[in-house]
C-alpha cells in the first residue's frame, strides 16, 4: 500500500480480520493518521511493544495513531489492541519511503520542522497537534488567578500564531501586568486576571497554505468574601486498631488566608462542655494553609486514649468553619469487633 497525501484508514472503525495485517510505505515528512475502533472506544496503539502516549509528535489518542511528520525512526511495527483486552485490532508495519529530496546529513529529527532545511516536504496547512488540550473552551476563574490559553499546532511551513481579544489584535500592552506569549508552547498566559480581562480570546494559526483559529471564552468571577469552606465528609469517621497509624483529612477552600487548627475533644471533671457552653478541646496542630500538610492530622501508633472526637477548625478574616469526626480504636486482639460511631457533624 503506497501512502500518498495523508495516510488514513477509512472508515474509522475496527477493520475486519482479513484487513488486520498491513504494510504502509510513508514518505519522510508526511503526516500519518490511522484509525482503530470508534473514537469514543478506540483501541490503544503500541509501537514495538510500548504503548504510545496521548501527547507528543507520535501519539495514540482516542483510537488514532497520529504522527505529525514521519521520520526514519518512526518506521516499525504498530499494534492496536482493543481496550481492556489483548485482542489485536490492527497489526501495521510502517516503512520509510523516499523523501522528495534526500540528504546525507544526520540531522536531529526536530530540525525537519525548519523550512530552511535542505529537506523538502509537502506543504501542509496548519492543524491542531494536541486537541485534547483545547477541550476547555470556557474559562470561568476567580479574579487574581492565572489563566492560560493554548493552541498547539503544526504545519509546513511551521505556522505562526497570533492572538485576538474580541476580534482585535491582542498584545497585552494595555493590560496591567501584560501578557506572556510562549510561541514554542503556542500559549498565552495572563496572571492576576481582573474583570476587564473578560472576553473572547482567539488564537489564529497560519502559514502560507492556510489558517485555523480557535476561540476561548474568559469570564472573571469577582470574589465575594466568605469564611472557609470545608469539603463535605471530611474529616471522616475512622476505625483503627491499637498500634496502627491514622490520618484524618480536612480540605479547606478559602479566598482569604485561612488559619487551620486540629482539635481533640476532651473531658474535664466528667464534663465535655464548659460553663460557657463550649466544648473542652485540646489543640493538636495549628498552622496556615500554606504550611505543609496542615490539612492532614497524623496519629501514630494509636492507643485507646486516642479514641474520641476530632475537629478541623478553619478561620479567616470573615469567619470560622469546622467539621468533626470520630476515631474509634479497637483492641489489637479483637479486630472483628466494631463500634458504631456517631455521624460526622458539619456546622456552617
Amino acid at each position: 500500500l503506497e501512502a500518498s497525501e495523508e495516510v488514513e484508514l477509512e472508515p474509522c472503525l475496527a477493520p475486519s480480520l482479513e484487513q488486520q495485517e498491513q504494510e504502509l510505505t510513508v514518505a519522510l515528512g508526511q503526516p500519518v493518521r490511522l484509525c482503530c475502533g470508534r473514537a469514543e472506544r478506540g483501541g490503544h496503539w503500541y509501537k514495538e511493544g510500548s504503548r504510545l502516549a496521548p501527547a507528543g509528535r507520535v501519539r495514540g489518542w482516542r483510537g488514532r495513531l497520529e504522527i505529525a511528520s514521519f521520520l526514519p525512526e518512526d518506521a516499525g511495527r504498530y499494534l492496536c489492541l482493543a481496550r481492556g483486552s489483548m485482542i489485536v485490532l490492527q497489526n501495521l508495519t510502517l516503512i520509510t519511503g523516499d523523501s522528495l529530496t534526500s540528504s546525507n546529513d544526520d540531522e536531529d529529527p526536530k530540525s525537519h520542522r525548519d523550512p530552511s532545511n535542505r529537506h523538502s516536504y509537502p506543504q501542509q496547512a496548519p492543524y491542531w497537534t494536541h486537541p485534547q488540550r483545547m477541550e476547555k473552551k470556557l474559562h470561568a476563574v476567580p479574579a487574581g488567578n492565572t489563566v492560560k490559553f493554548r493552541c498547539p499546532a503544526a504545519g509546513n511551513p511551521t505556522p505562526t500564531i497570533r492572538w485576538l481579544k474580541d476580534g482585535q489584535a491582542f498584545h497585552g500592552e494595555n493590560r496591567i501586568g501584560g501578557i506572556r506569549l510562549r510561541h514554542q508552547h503556542w500559549s498565552l498566559v495572563m496572571e492576576s486576571v481582573v474583570p476587564s480581562d473578560r472576553g473572547t480570546y482567539t488564537c489564529l494559526v497560519e502559514n502560507a497554505v492556510g489558517s485555523i483559529r480557535y476561540n476561548y471564552l474568559l469570564d472573571v468571577l469577582e470574589r465575594s468574601p466568605h469564611r472557609p469552606i470545608l469539603q463535605a465528609g471530611l474529616p471522616a469517621n475512622t476505625t483503627a486498631v491499637v498500634g496502627s497509624d491514622v490520618e484524618l483529612l480536612c480540605k479547606v477552600y478559602s479566598d482569604a488566608q485561612p488559619h487551620i487548627q486540629w482539635l481533640k475533644h476532651i473531658v474535664i471533671n466528667g464534663s465535655s462542655f464548659g460553663a460557657d457552653g463550649f466544648p473542652y478541646v485540646q489543640v493538636l496542630k495549628t498552622a496556615d494553609i500554606n504550611s505543609s500538610e496542615v490539612e492532614v492530622l497524623y496519629l501514630r501508633n494509636v492507643s485507646a486514649e486516642d479514641a474520641g472526637e476530632y475537629t478541623c477548625l478553619a478561620g479567616n478574616s470573615i469567619g470560622l468553619s469546622y467539621q468533626s469526626a470520630w476515631l474509634t480504636v479497637l483492641p489489637e486482639e479483637d479486630p472483628t469487633w466494631t463500634a458504631a460511631a456517631p455521624e460526622a457533624r458539619c456546622t456552617d
Epitope: 509528535r57 536531529d108 520542522r113 488540550r133 492560560k148 510561541h183 514554542q184 508552547h185 498566559v189
Partner: antibody, heavy 119, light 107 residues
Framework: QVQLLESGGGLVQPGGSLRLSCAAS????????MSWVRQAPGKGLEWVSV????????HYADSVKGRFTISRDNSKNTLYLQMNSLRAEDTAVYYC????????????WGQGTLVTVSS | DIQMTQSPSSLSASVGDRVTITCRAS??????LNWYQQKPGKAPKLLIY???NLQSGVPSRFSGSGSGTDFTLTISSLQPEDFAVYYC?????????FGQGTKVEIK
C-alpha cells in the same frame, strides 16, 4: 545522547557576581526552551528562570528578578545565568534543565554546579 | 504565584507497598503538573509529565492522576530503588513552582 554540563560555580562574597554556563550536546539546542533550577543545601527544588529556544521569551522567579539574567548562545549550544547582587540565600546547587516540547517538563538535567555565597 | 503543597512531607514504607503522594495547587492548573524523583547527590529525574503521562524509560509501576487542583503520584509496588524524594511541579503559570517534596523512606 543528550548531555548538559554546568560550570562556573564557586565561592563568592555577598553582593558579588558569578556567571554560570551550561554546555548542551546531543540535540538541536535551538529547538528547546531551557531552565535553571536550584536547590539549597538540604532543601527542595526551586525554579529560577526559563528562556525560549530562540531567546524570544524569558521569565524569572520573584526571588531573583532584577538580579539574575538568563541568556543563550545557540551557535555555541550554551545556556548562561548571570547572577549579580548575590545573597547568602542564593547558595545552592544550580541545575540547567531542558524542557520537553509542548510541555514545561524538564526531561534532561545537568549534574549541577555549587554556588556558595559567603563572606 | 501558584503554590504547590505536597503531602505527606515524609513517609515510611516497605518494599512491595503501594505508595500514594498527593500534590495540591492553590488554583486550577488544568493538567500542567509534572512529577520528579531525586536521589541524594543526584539531579532530579522526570517520572510523569502533564499529570498522567509516563516519561519514556520510567517503570510502569509509577502512575499519575488528577487535574485542576488535586494530583496524585502512585507507586503500585515499591521497589528498593524507589526510596527517594519526590517533587511535583506546576507549569501552568510562567513561574514553574515546585512542591516542597515528599521523602519516601524504608520502614
Amino acid at each position: 545522547q543528550v548531555q548538559l554540563l554546568e560550570s562556573g560555580g564557586g565561592l563568592v562574597q555577598p553582593g558579588g557576581s558569578l556567571r554560570l554556563s551550561c554546555a548542551a550536546s546531543g540535540f538541536t539546542f535551538s529547538d528547546y526552551a531551557m531552565s535553571w533550577v536550584r536547590q539549597a543545601p538540604g532543601k527542595g527544588l526551586e525554579w529560577v528562570s526559563v528562556i525560549e529556544g530562540d531567546g524570544s521569551y524569558t521569565h524569572y522567579a520573584d526571588s531573583v528578578k532584577g538580579r539574575f539574567t538568563i541568556s543563550r548562545d545557540n551557535s555555541k549550544n550554551t545556556l548562561y545565568l548571570q547572577m549579580n547582587s548575590l545573597r547568602a540565600e542564593d547558595t545552592a546547587v544550580y541545575y540547567c534543565a531542558r524542557e520537553k516540547t509542548y510541555s514545561s517538563a524538564f526531561d534532561y538535567w545537568g549534574q549541577g554546579t555549587l554556588v556558595t555565597v559567603s563572606s | 504565584d501558584i503554590q504547590m503543597t505536597q503531602s505527606p512531607s515524609s513517609l515510611s514504607a516497605s518494599v512491595g507497598d503501594r505508595v500514594t503522594i498527593t500534590c495540591r495547587a492553590s488554583q486550577d492548573i488544568s493538567s500542567d503538573l509534572n512529577w520528579y524523583q531525586q536521589k541524594p547527590g543526584k539531579a532530579p529525574k522526570l517520572l510523569i509529565y502533564d499529570a498522567s503521562n509516563l516519561q519514556s524509560g520510567v517503570p510502569s509501576r509509577f502512575s499519575g492522576s488528577g487535574s485542576g487542583t488535586d494530583f496524585t503520584l502512585t507507586i503500585s509496588s515499591l521497589q528498593p530503588e524507589d526510596f527517594a524524594v519526590y517533587y511535583c511541579q506546576q507549569h501552568y503559570s510562567p513561574s514553574h513552582t515546585f512542591g516542597q517534596g515528599t521523602k519516601v523512606e524504608i520502614k
